[in-house]
């Protein structure tokens, strides 16, 4: 009996035309939503003039339907038993699941000012930037609509730069009509224990963002894992959102719509400083902001973002060192709301429910030559927004799963 089940599972989780796995893999049958909470800055003037703590108030959720598009350019390679694809991006606003509209206004850090002052550190160039910032009436903070902040707006300061630069700025710009990849993953035909594991991303086995093992593309994309998952396993996966591979560990048994699943969570150790977790030494890319690699809970992904000083963390700086959140007032981290988890059906390795949570922050530093940053007396890692991307197997799919998979075993 067990062998027959194993054989059936092995056959059905292969990523090729005709299998259950392939059908759900090409186009997820699960509705995936991405909720955003924006950190609205309450005291922009005090921060700019006196280098006060930044007082933020989160506003949200603003919800979008995502991952509804089928994978594109799906190409099997029989020679190395891989399948390559592009994952198209798309987001549709869901007013009924949101607290307001895409036209809601927020006071947030001026992304262009913060980024330009970081990228161009030469003082003379900063003086040029300063004159353009003043001319465009830009400041350290700006008021933007949700739509502008997420999907892009024409920045008035960058529009004055007299040589070719991208003048459109947005945290997720460009998004709609773009795609992530190319991913090339093992289809599992020759070795089921490799199914869905990424072979290459954008044609490479490494990212070129980090040193040593930190630069590796490990595991799957977290949508599924090789079958017969054990509780003792450390599940590796790659997330292009955070420009790195990361891992999850078993936390508890969960019953999801009558299906027994394993809840795997991203442990605090994954966000620890190299002092606590020596494996993380290569995620520490500079010594000043990281206080000689002793700070933790924030990841500098600037190398992955054309030099823009983007820092990724968990929402509300969960698992981050006190020095990171100290200059920010209004944050209330808690594990239940702000950690990331994956609920994995262990026989198939399918992720049947997940909550991916992350926060996008931008570094802003004092600048002697940029007037609007001149009065700052410290560096700030400024939270802009946090997101919660969730998906849960639908009732119909859960019934099918119970009858065809878990029911057969029990």
């Amino acid at each position: 009996g067990d062998l027959l089940i194993q054989k059936t599972i092995k056959k059905q989780v292969v990523l090729e035309e005709g299998t259950i796995a392939f059908k759900n893999w090409v186009k997820t049958g699960t509705e995936v939503y991405r909720q955003f909470w924006i950190f609205d800055v309450q005291n922009p003037q005090e921060v700019m003039m006196n280098s006060s703590n930044i007082q933020v108030k989160q506003r949200g959720p603003y919800t979008y339907r995502v991952r509804f598009l089928a994978k594109e350019n799906v190409t099997q390679d029989a020679e190395d038993n891989t399948v390559s694809f592009l994952q198209p991006n798309g987001a549709i606003f869901e007013p009924s699941l949101s607290v307001g509209t895409e036209a809601d206004n927020f006071t947030v850090l001026n992304l262009a000012v913060a980024a330009a002052s970081h990228i161009y550190q030469n003082q003379f160039v900063q003086m040029i930037l300063n004159s353009l910032i003043n001319k465009s009436k830009s400041s350290m903070f700006q008021v933007r609509t949700l739509r502008e902040l997420l999907w892009g707006y024409r920045d008035p300061f960058l529009s004055l730069v007299p040589y070719p630069v991208t003048t459109t700025v947005g945290l997720f710009y460009p998004y709609n009509n773009t795609a992530d990849g190319v991913y090339k993953v093992f289809n599992g035909k020759d070795n089921i224990s490799k199914v869905a594991i990424i072979d290459t991303y954008k044609g490479k086995r490494n990212l070129s963002y980090w040193e040593s093992h930190c630069d590796m593309i490990n595991g799957t994309d977290a949508a599924s894992f090789p079958p017969f998952v054990e509780k003792s396993q450390v599940l590796q996966f790659f997330s292009s959102d955070i420009c790195r591979s990361i891992y999850a560990v078993f936390e508890s048994d969960v019953n999801l719509k009558g299906i027994p699943v394993y809840r795997f969570v991203l442990p605090s150790k994954a966000f620890a400083s190299p002092v606590e977790n020596p494996d993380n030494y290569c995620f520490c890319t500079e010594k000043i902001i990281s206080k000689n690699c002793t700070s933790y809970g924030v990841l500098d992904i600037s190398k992955c973002k054309e030099g823009r000083p983007v820092y990724i963390s968990l929402p509300h700086f969960l698992y981050a060192s006190p020095d990171v959140s100290e200059p920010i007032d209004g944050l209330n981290p808690n594990e239940e709301e702000h950690r990331t988890y994956l609920d994995i059906e262990p026989i198939t390795g399918f992720t049947l429910q997940f909550a991916k949570r992350l926060q996008v922050n931008l570094l802003v530093k004092p600048s002697e030559k940029i007037q609007v940053l001149k009065n700052l007396k410290r560096n700030y890692i400024v939270p802009i927004l946090w997101l919660n991307e969730t998906g849960t197997i639908g009732d119909e799919k859960a019934n099918m799963f119970r009858s065809q998979v878990t029911g057969k075993i029990n």
């Epitope: 030469n122 003379f124 160039v125 040029i128 004159s131 030559k369």
Partner: antibody
Framework: QVQLVQSGAEVKKPGSSVKVSCKAS????????MQWVRQAPGQGLEWMGG????????AYAQKFQGRVTLTADKSTSTAYMELSSLRSEDTAVYYC????????WGQGTLVTVSS | ETTVTQSPAFMSATPGDKVTISCITS??????MNWYQQKPGEPPKLLIS???TLRPGVPSRFSSSGYGTDFTFTINNIESEDAAYYYC?????????FGQGTKLEIK
């Protein structure tokens, strides 16, 4: 040691253009911006503009905007200042000088505008 | 534009004297003031850079002070070789602007 060597003296007719070169040595050219300053006979110093060879960032004094063009050739570590529509008041010694604090100066190029 | 008003335009001193030159700016420039010496037929020479920093190789009889809008350049124990023009330059904002210059004559 750091050296900035400028091209030789020029005599120009009103309405014409002049291009002064400044060859840098003794440091990595793209590490520092090059500024241009002029000094009319018996007068004080006047900043004309500056260029950062690394980013191509340029700033000009309002007075010279539209008449002066600054360029930098990283391959030869040379900066250039071109001034067009010359008039007699442009008769001056033109200096290239490095960085924001003008720490090293070229020897100067005398440009005489005369009919 | 930050205007820089330098005074006096001319001064005369005897070896061993102490002289001061003043530069006042129309806007707050922190300590972004530089001081130069220029002798006839030569390019200017940087003596003191931003933050009242004496340049390497410059004799310690030269000094400066000031912050914000008021700046002072001092030569203690003047020597005959100090006869020259002296200029201040603000490097806080664009356009960079010079003072009008001070001619120092040694009797």
């Amino acid at each position: 040691q750091v050296q900035l060597v400028q091209s030789g003296a020029e005599v120009k007719k009103p309405g014409s253009s002049v291009k002064v070169s400044c060859k840098a040595s003794g440091y990595r050219f793209s590490d520092y911006e090059m500024q241009w300053v002029r000094q009319a006979p018996g007068q004080g110093l006047e900043w004309m503009g500056g260029i950062d060879p690394e980013t191509g960032g340029i700033a000009y004094a309002q007075k010279f905007q539209g008449r002066v063009t600054l360029t930098a050739d990283k391959s030869t570590s040379t900066a250039y200042m071109e001034l067009s529509s010359l008039r007699s008041e442009d008769t001056a010694v033109y200096y290239c000088t490095r960085k924001l604090d003008f720490d090293y100066w070229g020897q100067g190029t005398l440009v005489t505008v005369s009919s | 534009e930050t205007t820089v008003t330098q005074s006096p335009a001319f001064m005369s001193a005897t070896p061993g004297d102490k002289v001061t030159i003043s530069c006042i700016t129309s806007t707050d420039i922190d300590d972004d003031m530089n001081w130069y010496q220029q002798k006839p037929g030569e390019p200017p020479k940087l003596l003191i850079s931003e933050g009242n920093t004496l340049r390497p190789g410059v004799p310690s009889r030269f000094s400066s002070s000031g912050y914000g809008t008021d700046f002072t350049f001092t030569i203690n124990n003047i020597e005959s070789e100090d006869a020259a023009y002296y200029y201040c330059l603000q490097s806080d904002n664009l356009p960079l602007t010079f003072g009008q210059g001070t001619k120092l004559e040694i009797k």
